[in-house]
Each structure stands twice: as C-alpha cells, then as structure tokens.
C-alpha cells in the first residue's frame, strides 16, 4: 500500500527548529499507555501504531508525527512515518527505536501506543487431492437474490479472480499491505499466494460451492504468500474500507476477516469504529484451541466471531490445535474439509479446514440475510444468526471444563426463510470476563449499543459471590457481579435483547428487616418485570428462604433473601408482556432448569433462594439454568432446595407489525 501521506515517507534526521518547541505535556491526569502482543514470537518491535485521542484532527495527527520526528532527531534517532491514520482512528504508524517510546507516550493527543504484531490466516493449508464441487441440494433454502444487494470485503491473501467459481463476482482492489515472506529461499508461486483467499471467496460466493451465490466481493491483500500479515496492515485495510464507504456509499457491507493475531487493543478499536459505522464484521475465532478472547480481532465485541465445527457438529481439531472457544465466540459454523475454489487452476476445487472457512460461511449467511432485509442493524443481524442457529448440538466435552459454560452451543444455519422473523423478541446471553479472585473484584457484562439489558445474573464456580446488580454506566445499563472473600472470582451475565422503543429502569429494595425476605416490584404504569437481581454485602448469606411462591396477582415482583438488596428490571415497550415461570426442586440438585414455551423469549433468569450454595444462574438460549454446589458438599435437604425463576416475555406489537408486513 503506497502511503497517501507521501510527505512522511522519508527518513528524518532534522526538522525545522521551531518544531522542537512544541513538546507540551499531555493533558493533566491522563497517561498514555503502551501495549504489545502477549505472544512474543508474533511481536514486531520497531514498528508502532501511535493512537491519538478520539477527536484529534488529521492536521493534529500530522503535527504530532512531525513533533515526534523532531524530538527523536534531536536525540540522534532516525524515524520514519509509514502512514497517517484518519477516517477510522486518528494516529500514525511509525518505524522507530523502542528507546523512543517514553518520549512518544508524552506527546500531546496520544491515547496509547501499540507495538505492531503479526496476524495469520486461519485455515490449515490445502490438501493436495483435487475434488469435484458439491451438487446443489434442493432441500437447502436458496433465496432468489442470493445476497446480491450486499458487498462483502475480504481481507486476505491475493486471489485468483479468474477462477470459474468467482469470476465476475470478485473485484480485486489495488490495496496491498503485506510483510516480506519468511525464509531465504521463498519462491512466490501464484497458486500458493492465492490459495487462502481464493478458497474463502469461493466459500462466500462461489457459483457451485458458495453460500451466498449472488454476493459481490472486493478483495484487499493483507496476508502474504505464507498467510502472514500485520496488525498495522489490517488497520490500514479497514481504514481503506471506511474511506471507500464514505466516497461511494453502497448497500449493506460485510467485512470478512479470516485471520487472527494476539490480543490487540488497536485492532479491536478499529473494528469497533467500523461496526459503529454500520459495517458487519465477521472474523475467525482462531485455530489455537484456546480462549478466543486472547486473540484479535476475535475478541472485539462488535465483531461476529466464528468457531469451527465438523460435519458431526464436533469442534474442529487441527492436530494438537483446533478451533478457539469461550465467551468471545458468537457461534460456530462448518469449518472442516470445506470444499471451495482452488488456485491450482481455474476449474480446480480443494478442501480446506479452519475457523477462516467457518467465518466465510457466516459471512455468506449474513450476506443473504442482509440482502433480504437490507435495513438490519448489526445487533439485529447477530441476534438473528443466533436465533436461527442449531442449538445444543456441539459435544462440549471437547472444550476445557472451565470454558464449557462460556462457549455458545450454536452452529450457524440459514434461516428457513429470510422473512417472518420480525415478530420475534430476540435475546442473547453475554458473559463478562472473569473478575479475578480479589475480595472486592467485580465483573461487568455489557450489551451492544442498540440492545436493551433486560436482566442480570452472576455465576461463581466456588459459590463465593455477593450477587449482582444492574447499574448505569455512560448512559446505559450494565450488569455488575461481585466476588466474595475467599472466592475464586465471578462472572456477570447480561441478557441482551432487541426491544424497539423500550424504556427500562431498575427498581431497588434494600435488605429487609423482617424475616419474610426482600421484595421489589414494577410500580410504574405499563412497566413489566423483565429480570430480577440480588446483591448482598455480607460474606455468606444465611439459609433463610423467602416464600418461593410469590403472592397471587403480583407477577411483577422480585423476591429474595432478607439480607440482600433486590433489583427489578422494569420495562415499558409497545405490546410487551411478561410472565414469571418457576421450577423448584425440594431435594439438592446440581442443576435446576426452567424454559420458556414456544413464542415466548427468556429475558430473566435467577435463583431462589440466594444462599451461598447456589453457584449462580444464567440463560442458555430459552432456558434458565441455576447451578448449585456439588450435592455431596451441601448440608441438609432443605438447604439444598433450589428454585429456578425464568421471566418469559413476548411482544404483541412486533407480532402485529410483522403480520401487517406480510
């Protein structure tokens, strides 16, 4: 990629002397931070992305870059500005000695600096066998337009655009930003260089083997012939897409990022900005048999992160490694022995495996959904992808034990029809990061900007927690869980829903003095109860059990332990109705569940009583799960009795609006 800001390409030893006087201190009380990849072999020391504060203008970015060069030159250091970012994130890419980091961090407008690092294609390399493409399956839903209203951007290797599968469907842009290949004797062989990208383009929109056969694609080269790229190259690619979008606005955009590197604050930030500009980003979870939250862009909350399963709905194993997992994965998709275009010849097919292939599947499904409903927001699309997925088909035993509860058991599927889902109240479960074990540690789970937080729960493997509560943060409700003394840490679990024109608030009742327990209800006219939370300051709640059955005629009420404060999530939205459903088991049981029936959506999930042997509650699809400590460790039978409380809602308004459309 030739830098548009050509002025900054030259090595600089000296600059106009007046530049030297510009080193004002950063704003009071703010300290710029330095970040680098946790995976040492993937670090690229000597190249740094200097990220400036959000409102910084291009001229200020250029001035800050010049200032850095001037001050570095005074100290006898060469620097080279490789790129000035604008349009997505303000900042610049600089080649310099690590000795200058302290100086750079003190520059005005600097928010943080990140050392560049490697990203990698997430397919295991091609099999050598030639394959014939699959036949069209009549039972598979094929919408007439096949994604034709959508443009899919592919950030990958170069591609063989004249392959019969993708000819005329993929426009190769002039964007290229790749590192040198490793090794002294590397020969660039076109078919090898194009292998990864060609295959993925075929999976998305190939004539025979593509998911969205009508989608048009644009390719950007950010991975070299060995499938290796850089965070900085990917950032510049994302910026290129944003600028293209501004210059020539088209219909819905999907960006496929079939690559992964170590956790990167700046790559995640760029993805967030692009997503908030209305672009749908789909990425590979990574092929490291590891927590996807440790990788980028997989860990970016705004990105749809896809893990890989095989034809038997098992997580894909790739030697010792395999698909990533965990709370940062949104869903899984087919990613083993996926047939697609081979760059060996213009009619060749090959099978490849990995989370890249899985992500390409989801990008294709997203293109189809967006083509049918071009006005869908990212939040709506994600909720639909989750809603139409096959549920509970993955064998969770493959995942590490501590990751099973966090990993979504969802395999992407095409909707039976792209219309008719509008009436549904869509909700998803969002897990926080682990709080850590310190006494006052908390964990926070957040919904996407255009989702409503309808309930909040918490979970701790040790059972030592102090509950959870919903609180306002930056004008939005978040779910915060509290660790307890001696606890190994907690998770906060948010139930995030699409509820247009909703007005939600939290009503709190402090711990009750009386032995009957604490109660709180939704007293505002037209507000219905969508979730209950409880939070306590005492280290260990006693065994007091409030009456499990709430009084008749008071469905809008949360009840809880007398030593806990109880929080009710109360919402008003057109046509919203909710009901409470309970399932109590008198004998000790490690897991109690209660599900909402067809046509109703689970919005709230909590446990009664909130005593210390309850590990917590969380929603899995439309089922409320309450987990208790191992029955062998709980005391008496009465102590072990637990009730799962589900709040099930539906929207008559959405149903009516949907019927009017049909």
């Amino acid at each position: 990629q030739e830098d548009e800001d050509g002025d900054y390409e030259e090595l600089v030893l000296a600059l106009r002397s007046e530049e030297d006087g510009l080193a004002e201190a950063p704003e009071h009380g703010t300290t710029a931070t330095f970040h680098r990849c946790a995976k040492d072999p993937w670090r690229l020391p000597g190249t740094y992305v200097v990220v400036l504060k959000e409102e910084t203008h291009l001229s200020q970015s250029e001035r800050t870059a010049r200032r850095l060069q001037a001050q570095a030159a005074r100290r006898g250091y060469l620097t080279k500005i490789l790129h000035v970012f604008h349009g997505l994130l303000p900042g610049f890419l600089v080649k310099m000695s690590g000795d200058l980091l302290e100086l750079a961090l003190k520059l005005p407008h600097v928010d943080y600096i990140e050392e560049d690092s490697s990203v990698f294609a997430q397919s295991i390399p091609w099999n050598l066998e030639r394959i014939t493409p699959p036949r069209y399956r009549a039972d598979e839903y094929q919408p007439p337009d096949g994604g034709s209203l959508v443009e899919v951007y592919l950030l990958d290797t170069s591609i063989q655009s004249d392959h019969r599968e993708i000819e005329g469907r993929v426009m190769v842009t002039d964007f290229e930003n790749v590192p040198e290949e490793d090794g002294t004797r590397f020969h660039r062989q076109a078919s090898k260089c194009d292998s990864h990208g060609t295959h993925l383009a075929g999976v998305v929109s190939g004539r025979d083997a593509g998911v969205a056969k009508g989608a048009s694609m644009r390719s950007l080269r950010v991975l070299n012939c060995q499938g290796k790229g850089t965070v900085s190259g990917t950032l510049i690619g994302l910026e290129f897409i944003r600028k293209s979008q501004l210059v020539q606005p088209v219909g819905p955009l999907v960006v496929l990022l079939p690559l992964a590197g170590g956790y990167s604050r700046v790559l995640n930030a760029a993805c967030q900005r692009l997503a908030r500009a209305g672009v749908v980003l789909v990425t590979a979870a990574g092929n490291f048999r590891d927590d996807a939250c440790l990788y980028s862009p997989a860990s970016a909350p705004e990105v749809i992160t896809v893990g890989a399963t095989n034809a038997q709905d098992q997580p894909v194993t790739l030697g010792t490694l395999g698909t990533n997992f965990g709370r940062c994965v949104d869903l899984f998709a087919p990613g083993e022995d996926i047939i697609g275009a081979s760059s060996d010849c213009s009619t060749c097919f090959v099978s490849q495996s990995g989370t890249s292939q899985a992500a390409a599947h989801v990008a294709g499904i997203a293109a189809m959904m967006l083509s049918a409903e071009p006005e869908l927001t990212l939040a709506e699309l994600r909720q639909r992808l989750i809603h139409f997925s096959a549920k509970d088909v993955i064998n969770e035993a493959w995942f590490p034990e501590d990751q099973r509860v966090l990993t979504p058991n969802l395999v992407a599927a095409l909707p039976p029809s792209t219309h008719g889902a509008g009436w549904q109240l869509f909700c998803r479960t969002v897990w926080s990061a682990h709080s850590g074990p310190t006494r006052m540690a908390t964990a926070v789970a957040r919904c996407a900007p255009d989702e409503e937080l309808l309930s909040c729960s918490s979970f701790s493997r040790s059972g030592k927690r102090r509950g959870e509560r919903m609180e306002a943060q930056g004008g939005k409700l978040v779910c915060r869980a509290h660790n307890a003394f001696g606890g190994e840490g907690v998770y906060a679990i948010a139930r995030c829903c699409l509820l247009p024109q909703a007005n939600c608030s939290v009503h709190t009742a402090p711990p009750a003095e009386a032995s009957m327990g604490t109660r709180v209800h939704c007293h505002q006219q037209g507000h219905v109860l969508t979730g209950c939370s409880s939070h306590w300051e005492v280290e260990d709640l006693g065994t007091h059990k409030p009456p499990v059955l709430r009084p008749r005629g008071q469905p809008n009420q949360c009840v809880g332990h007398r030593e806990a404060s109880i929080h009710a999530s109360c919402c008003h939205a057109p046509g919203l109705e909710c009901k409470v459903k309970e399932h109590g088991i008198p004998a000790p049981q490690e897991q109690v569940t209660v599900a909402c029936e067809e046509g109703w959506t689970l919005t709230g999930c909590s446990a009664l009583p909130g005593t210390s042997h309850v590990l917590g509650a969380y929603a899995v699809d439309n089922t409320c799960v309450v987990r208790s400590r191992d029955v062998s460790t709980t005391g008496s039978t009465s102590e072990g009795a637990v009730t799962a409380v589900a709040i099930c809602c539906r929207s008559r308004h959405l149903a009516q609006a949907s019927q009017e459309l049909q």
Partner: antibody
Framework: QVQLVESGGGVVQPGRSLRLSCAAS????????MHWVRQAPGKGLEWVAL????????YYADSVKGRFTISRDNSKNTLYLQMNSLRAEDTAVYYC???????????????WGHGTTVTVSS | QSVLTQPPSVSAAPGQKVTISCSGS????????VSWYQQLPGTAPKLLIY???KRPSGIPDRFSGSKSGTSATLGITGLQTGDEADYYC???????????FGTGTRVTVL
C-alpha cells in the same frame, strides 16, 4: 490413528551416505511442517532439520548444514532425510516429528515416531 | 553444547511437587514459544506443554508450564512413579534459525 514410522537406519561407514524415510498416516500430512530430531546414545535431544508443510522453507542445525538435506513428498505422505558425508558423531536414534502447526513452526513438535538407529562406524 | 540450560536431575517423594527450570536468552525463550517434552526410558519423546503453558489433550493438569523473561519452568504436582523420565524444554532460536532443546533433566521419584 496419527502415526509416524521411520525407516532407513543402519550401520554405515564414515563418509558414506544414508537416506531416512518417515511415513505419515492418520492426518493430512501436507498441512504440517515436519522435523528431524536425533539422540546420541546416552545423550539429550538434538534438533536436526525442519521443512515447512509445502516444502518452501528448510532449516538445518549448524552441525549438519551442507551435509544433510530434508525433503518431503506430500503425495506419498513421506518425509526424507538425505545424509551425506556421515561422521561418527552422527551416530544416534533419528526421530521424525510433526510440527504443532503449519505456519507457527516454532511452536514445537506434537507427534513423534519411534525412531530409527543410525550407526556410523568403520 | 545446548543453548538452553536445565538442572541435570531433580527428585521428590510420591505426591510431592517438583519444578524444572530452563534458562535461555532473548533469542530463544525470551521471544519464542516454549514446549516441554517427556521421554520415558526407552521410548520416544512426548509433548507435555506447548505455548509456555498449554497442555495437549490427554496430558493431566498435574503438569504446568510458565515463563518469565528468558527462563521457563515446568511444574509437576502429585508426583507419581510413572513420572520418572527425562524432561526437555525446547524452543525456536531466532538467531540460529533453528529449534533448540534443553540439556535435559532426569526426574526421580524417591
């Protein structure tokens, strides 16, 4: 199941040549980098050579550079080590081992063969 | 001469914990992934730990790995007689452009 079987070892005189083979089965051979590692009698492990999954890059230990050549035939699922100008200090059990991942060759080795013995003696 | 240094031997009673150190430099352990291998008497080596602290499936969680700077450590808890073996650390060395193994440590269960 995943298996690597070495062959071609034997007794050879100093200065002579020997070619070791490693037959792979139970996995997609062309998707993984491959190593040769050796172990002299009563000694520790010594890395010998690495070849990338597609053969595009090869790396050698200084002790064998210029004398040994690593190669592979992905259509036959076989890895080779051509050993020329053999010396007494090349006497060892030679193991072939699979790289944990294709592009992340520096991760290490996850599957090992049982080894084949090479004795260089006059 | 190996560029990664390990203690020649460590020993402990059954059920106890042992740690094995592996010392290198910035060109190997400092900037590359560390793996640990177990070689039971008369057998081929077996991967125990990769990427500093990850266990392949089938390796019990009694085995753990960590890294600090240019050193790596293998920990074995709840020592069993079946753990008697030679243990090797290994990593890529960027300056040598090759893989390097540690000198090896013999673990004895008393």
């Amino acid at each position: 199941q995943v298996q690597l079987v070495e062959s071609g070892g034997g007794v050879v005189q100093p200065g002579r040549s020997l070619r070791l083979s490693c037959a792979a089965s139970g996995f997609t051979f062309s998707s993984f980098g491959m190593h040769w590692v050796r172990q002299a009698p009563g000694k520790g492990l010594e890395w010998v050579a690495l070849i990338w999954n597609d053969g595009s890059n090869k790396y050698y230990a200084d002790s064998v550079k210029g004398r040994f050549t690593i190669s592979r035939d992905n259509s036959k699922n076989t890895l080779y080590l051509q050993m020329n100008s053999l010396r007494a200090e090349d006497t060892a059990v030679y193991y072939c081992a699979r790289a944990i991942a294709a592009l992340y060759y520096y991760y290490g080795m996850d599957v090992w063969g049982h080894g084949t013995t090479v004795t260089v003696s006059s | 001469q190996s560029v990664l240094t390990q203690p020649p031997s460590v020993s402990a009673a059954p059920g106890q914990k042992v740690t094995i150190s592996c010392s290198g430099s910035s060109s190997n352990i400092g900037n590359n992934f560390v793996s640990w291998y177990q070689q039971l008497p008369g057998t081929a080596p077996k991967l125990l730990i990769y990427d500093y602290n990850k266990r392949p499936s089938g390796i019990p969680d009694r085995f753990s790995g960590s890294k600090s700077g240019t050193s790596a450590t293998l920990g074995i808890t709840g020592l069993q007689t079946g753990d008697e073996a030679d243990y090797y650390c290994g990593t890529w060395d960027s300056s040598l452009s090759g893989y390097v193994f540690g000198t090896g440590t013999r673990v004895t269960v008393l």
